[in-house]
């Protein structure tokens, strides 16, 4: 004779599992009893149930109320059992041992797999839940739209910040240059540019206000290095230095003349308008703040 079973039985969590075990005997063989046991590796066999041809089904205390025989009509050679309300802990190896007369004992093993699904359907564990699927799709689309919105907002804010900065630069550039040149003209007799403290013209390293630390999960937003343009135009400090180099003489009168000459040269970069000095228009302006610091 031979014992027929399944290699793997798959059931959804909370549903009932049929553990098949059918003995196809040779002529005149009778099945005396079928014993079911849990036989996970590393652990001793744990009895589930005993199906006796004469005395019926006996279920072990650990599985009381959870193991049944399939409903009749039932083939007397069928040793299958029904495990009710499968839980995760039921997953593992099971053995069916059939005792026959006169052929002796036969045994077979199967593996029970318990699937955990979010929305189990009794109709079919493999059926796709269309509602869940559509919810996921809508969620993904919403996330993408949100990412797109974030990108647009960030780009717009960057653009506006740059615009505002450019406006401020132009405005302060005009103010500073006008103010400093006016002061220099007024106090040219008392001011020696060489005595000006060095730190007043040092470049000030400030954090770029536009720098964006992107912690979002949107892959759409890739960070690009900010494109900064470095001016090649002669700065006010350089003009002053050039002015100093023109006249190495020590006389006070010479100095005054040199100062005037320097101022004249500096004035080439400005236009007089309504009583104030304005920087000549250039495509590459430089922002010098009120303290004369270059940014």
């Amino acid at each position: 004779g031979e014992l027929e079973t399944s290699d793997v039985v798959t059931v959804v969590l909370g549903q009932d599992a049929k553990l098949p075990c059918f003995y196809r005997g040779d002529s005149g063989e009778q099945v005396g009893q079928v014993a079911w046991a849990r036989v996970d590796a590393g652990e001793g066999a744990q009895e589930l149930a005993l199906l006796h041809s004469k005395y019926g089904l006996h279920v072990s205390p650990a599985y009381e109320g959870r193991v049944e025989q399939p409903p009749p009509p039932r083939n007397p050679l069928d040793g299958s059992v029904l495990l009710r309300n499968a839980v995760q802990a039921d997953e593992g190896e099971y053995e069916c041992r059939v005792s026959t007369f006169p052929a002796g004992s036969f045994q077979a093993r199967l593996r029970l797999r318990v699937l955990v699904v979010l929305d189990p359907q009794e109709d079919s564990g493999k059926q796709v839940d269309l509602v869940s699927a559509s919810v996921v799709v809508v969620g993904v689309i919403a996330a993408l739209l949100f990412c797109l919105l974030v990108v647009v907002v960030v780009l717009m804010s960057r653009y506006h910040r740059r615009k505002a900065q450019q406006m401020t630069q132009k405005y302060e550039e005009e103010l500073t240059l006008t103010r400093e040149n006016s002061i220099r003209r007024l106090h040219s007799h008392h001011t020696d540019p060489r005595s000006q403290p060095e730190e007043s013209v040092g470049l000030r390293a400030e954090g770029h206000p536009d720098s964006l630390k992107d912690n979002s999960s949107c892959s759409v937003m890739s960070e690009e290095p900010e494109g900064r343009s470095y001016s090649t135009l002669t700065t006010v400090r350089e003009i002053e230095t050039q002015t100093e180099l023109l006249s190495p003489g020590s006389g006070r009168a010479e100095e005054e003349e040199d100062q005037d000459e320097g101022i004249k040269q500096a004035m080439n970069h400005f236009v007089q308008e309504n009583g104030t000095l304005r920087a000549k228009p250039t495509g590459n302006g430089i922002y010098i703040n009120g303290r004369g610091h270059l940014v």
């Epitope: 059918f22 005997g25 009778q30 409903p71 009509p73 083939n75």
Partner: antibody, heavy 118, light 107 residues
Framework: QVQLKQSGPGLVQPSQSLSITCTVS????????VNWVRQPPGKGLEWLGV???????DYNAAFISRLSISKDISKSQVFFKMNSLQADDTAKYYC????????????WGQGTSVTVSS | DIQMTQSPASLSVSVGETVTITCRAS??????LAWYQQKQGKSPQLLVY???NLADGVPSRFSGSGSGTQYSLKINSLQSEDFGTYWC?????????FGGGTKLEIK
């Protein structure tokens, strides 16, 4: 090879009994059970009952009171008997062997056409 | 009684096409299901047992699937000899009932 051959009357009087014999070859009745199924003309199939390899029987609950199935292992024969036939029992009656998983019917007889009429 | 609802009731298809016949049980039958083919004036023939297992001698273009209450029989690349009526049957509780049948006709 496996074969199931049926023999029985084609016409039965109302309220009378129907007896059909299914003679098998190519397998032993001690190893396999035999089912009985009927099919009214132009209609579907209806399971009536089974006699298992060990000799025990199971019947369709709707026919339990007027149906009996038995067998003679030495002659390799299965006997079907239904009492109190009416016009709506007119059908083709089949015997079929249970196979594989102990349930599905893998070999069928040629069928016996039975008409219940006076 | 467990009711077996088979669909469609009839199907008109051409040779070479693929068809799927479904059978729905009124309650869980734990894959205790068989599919049969019956030709006009002949006895039924077993195609599939245990919902998914192909019977001996049945061409591989036939396949059974399903679990719980929903089962189906698929026939790939229909041949002329595949036309006839198909039946599903459950073996879970008394009585074992058949579906209403699906008549497969040549288009």
């Amino acid at each position: 090879q496996v074969q199931l051959k049926q023999s029985g009357p084609g016409l039965v009087q109302p309220s009378q009994s129907l007896s059909i014999t299914c003679t098998v070859s190519g397998f032993s009745l001690t190893n396999y059970g035999v089912n009985w199924v009927r099919q009214p003309p132009g209609k579907g199939l209806e399971w009536l009952g089974v006699i298992w390899s060990g000799g025990s029987t199971d019947y369709n609950a709707a026919f339990i009171s007027r149906l009996s199935i038995s067998k003679d292992i030495s002659k390799s024969q299965v006997f079907f008997k239904m009492n109190s036939l009416q016009a709506d029992d007119t059908a083709k009656y089949y015997c079929a062997r249970e196979g594989y998983d102990g349930y599905a019917m893998d070999y069928w007889g040629q069928g016996t056409s039975v008409t219940v009429s006076s | 009684d467990i009711q077996m609802t088979q669909s469609p009731a009839s199907l008109s298809v051409s040779v070479g096409e693929t068809v799927t016949i479904t059978c729905r049980a009124s309650e869980n039958i734990f894959s205790s299901l068989a599919w049969y083919q019956q030709k006009q004036g002949k006895s039924p023939q077993l195609l599939v047992y245990g919902a998914t297992n192909l019977a001996d001698g049945v061409p591989s273009r036939f396949s059974g699937s399903g679990s719980g209450t929903q089962y189906s029989l698929k026939i790939n690349s229909l041949q002329s000899e595949d036309f006839g009526t198909y039946w599903c049957q459950h073996f879970w509780g008394n009585p074992w009932t058949f579906g209403g049948g699906t008549k497969l006709e040549i288009k």
